[in-house]
């Protein structure tokens, strides 16, 4: 490309006319401020293309950059451009006008920026000032570009003197923007709502100042748009929040709500979604199984737990034998219902140092205005067995009897055993089980009684021994689900004058 006059900088007189010519081996065009001003294009006989730009009645506003570039998209070195800068000193024009966006300079990192205050005359002295201060900042200035530097978040103005008149530029505002990788979180006041209630969602971005929110939601697909509200939370780092509020939800509002956030500076984006369920009416649903028979061990603490889902939050009551339970002042009973997620609850009844009287029929009832559920079970108090009595007697019949009595809950089993070698028993020799029907030497009779008030079983077992010819160690063992107990007695033959 050949430009005449070649420049690169020209100073022209106001009100004059000036001709710029550009020629090249392909079609060429003059550009001014990204537009093509009226110009004459021609092709010479030797195949050279040219364009002539005639500038008439020049004013200071003609000051600026002019480019000559190839005009075809086939691109003979399409990157080739010739730049010319023209000054038209004009005392009636102070600073060249700026587009509104040039007055706001946004930065995301430490980098040189240019405050683009330009004058029409390259001989003018231009100074840069903070808007609030008179002191000129000694900052590098290029008449074609402006002041270059690393600037803080402040407002700046340029000053020059034309004749005896001091002229100020518009104010330029420098903003350092906080930009980081986008981190979006979405939450809802409630993810389950009844129809007619409100849906309110919040989308929050941390660490960015300039972001764009876009929501997608079921209602949008049917063309019913909702206008979100965006606000700044006043804590650091920067928190920006978009709130989507849908009053009086309908069943069709159930579905996925997505917040898409884009940050235009670095072109980052992130999105998060949340599911909202709109139900016709509230509900209460039991989760998991709770057996109809529950157990607790005497004098131990026991927690009975029921898990359920509900919306809206329910009232929970516990009953024993149809009487309402509450936290006892003595600390024997503790009731608690806690929210483990938005709609999931765990209700617990804790019995502290369980007493026999706490056996009975328990019911948990969870309810609200739309629904209710109840769960019942029988609580059995398990009592470890204890042998209350083990005695030996000599009836007239000549046989010898041993009586064992014990109690426990659930019903205890009784095991009789004997050992004939006292020196080696029971450490070396295992005791022999007694009372089997095949054994003729002994007979067994067992009776079981249930004591309602104490809520436990009593077992009485009598062992009849036919011939005892030497000392015999007889052991009674009671066993149930929560323990065992043993007592021992030495049975001696009739003929021996003593017993141990």
């Amino acid at each position: 490309l050949v430009v005449t006059p070649p420049g690169p900088e020209l100073v022209l007189n106001v009100s004059s006319t000036f001709v710029l010519t550009c020629s090249g081996s392909a079609p060429v065009v003059w550009e001014r401020m990204s537009q093509e001003p009226p110009q004459e294009m021609a092709k010479a006989q030797d195949g050279t293309f040219s364009s002539v730009l005639t500038l008439t009645n020049l004013t200071g506003l003609d000051t600026g950059e002019y480019f000559c570039t190839h005009n075809d998209s086939r691109g003979l070195e399409t990157d080739e451009r010739k730049r010319l800068y023209i000054f038209v000193p004009d005392p009636t024009v102070g600073f060249l006008p700026n587009d509104a966006e040039e007055l706001f300079i946004f930065l995301t990192e430490i980098t040189e920026i240019t405050i683009p205050c330009r004058v029409t005359d390259p001989q003018l002295v231009v100074t840069l000032h903070e808007k609030k201060g008179d002191v000129a900042l000694p900052v590098p200035y290029d008449h074609q570009r402006g002041f270059s530097g690393i600037f803080e978040d402040r407002s700046y103005i340029c000053k020059t003197t034309i004749g005896d008149r001091e002229v100020d530029s518009d104010a330029y505002y420098v903003y350092r923007l906080q930009v980081s990788s986008i981190n979006v979180s979405v939450n809802a006041v409630q993810t389950v709502v009844r129809q007619g209630e409100n849906i309110t969602l919040m989308c929050i971005v941390i660490g960015n100042e300039v972001v764009n929110f876009e929501w997608t939601y079921p209602r949008k697909e049917s063309g019913r748009l909702v206008e979100p509200v965006t606000d700044f939370l006043l804590d650091m780092p920067y928190h920006i929040r978009s709130i989507l509020h849908i009053p009086s939800a309908e069943l069709e509002d159930s579905g996925t709500y997505t917040c898409n956030v884009t940050e235009s500076v670095n072109d980052h984006q992130d999105e998060k979604a949340i599911n909202i369920t709109v139900v016709e009416s509230g509900y209460v649903r039991l989760l998991g199984e709770v057996g109809t028979l529950q157990f607790a061990e005497l004098h131990r603490s026991r927690t009975l737990q029921v898990v359920f889902e509900a919306y809206p939050p329910p009232t929970v009551l516990w009953f024993k034998d149809n009487r309402t339970l509450g936290d006892s002042s003595a600390g024997e009973i503790a009731l608690s219902t806690r929210n483990v997620s938005e709609t999931r609850y765990v209700s617990e009844l804790t019995l502290v140092r369980v007493k026999v009287a706490e056996a009975g029929h328990y019911t948990m009832r969870a309810f609200h205005e739309d629904a209710e559920v109840q769960l019942s079970f029988q609580l059995q108090i398990n009592v470890p067995v204890r042998v209350l009595e083990l005695s030996e007697s000599h009836p007239d019949s000549g046989e010898q009897t041993v009586r064992c009595r014990g109690r426990g809950m659930p019903q205890p089993n009784i095991i009789w055993s004997a050992c004939r070698d006292l020196k080696r028993c029971p450490r070396e020799l295992p005791p022999t089980l007694l009372g089997n029907s095949s054994e003729e030497e002994s007979q067994l009779e067992t009776n079981v009684t249930y004591w309602e008030e104490e809520q436990e079983f009593e077992v009485v077992s009598t062992l009849r021994l036919q011939h005892v010819d030497r000392p015999l160690s007889v052991r009674c063992t009671l066993r149930n689900a929560v323990g065992q107990d043993t007592q021992e007695v030495i049975v001696v033959p009739h003929s021996l004058p003593f017993k141990v």
Epitope: L137, V139, D142, G149, I150, E152
Partner: nanobody, 115 residues
């Protein structure tokens, strides 16, 4: 981490010359307007001179015509040629981004003008 290392200071007689250098490591030197600052005893730090990324320069009125700033982007270095030094130029000289300092200050280099 960005480091600024200033050198070239010293004791010089009035009317003498010095050339200060500042090497910037670990940063985008070529995208920074760089400059020299100075702090005289008991005074605030002041702007001395700056050079843009394309080589445009500026200097404070007090040093205009005496001090010249330049840069070498290939060496990540900024220079301050100081001629016709005066006793009032005595100070610790620092380089940094300009006119607002965004980098961690270096140790500076002491310039003393005295007969």
């Amino acid at each position: 981490e960005v480091q600024l290392v200033e050198s070239g200071g010293g004791l010089v007689q009035p009317g003498g010359s010095l050339r200060l250098s500042c090497v910037v490591s670990g940063s985008s030197f070529s995208s920074y307007t760089m400059g020299w600052f100075r702090r005289a005893p008991g005074k605030q730090r002041e702007l001395v001179a700056g050079v843009s990324t394309v080589g445009d320069t500026a200097a404070a009125d007090s040093v205009k015509g005496r001090f010249t700033i330049s840069r070498d982007n290939a060496k990540n270095t900024v220079y301050l040629q100081m001629n016709s030094l005066k006793p009032e130029d005595t100070a610790v000289y620092y380089c940094n981004t300009y006119p607002h300092a965004y980098l961690e200050w270096g140790q500076g280099t002491q310039v003393t003008v005295s007969s």
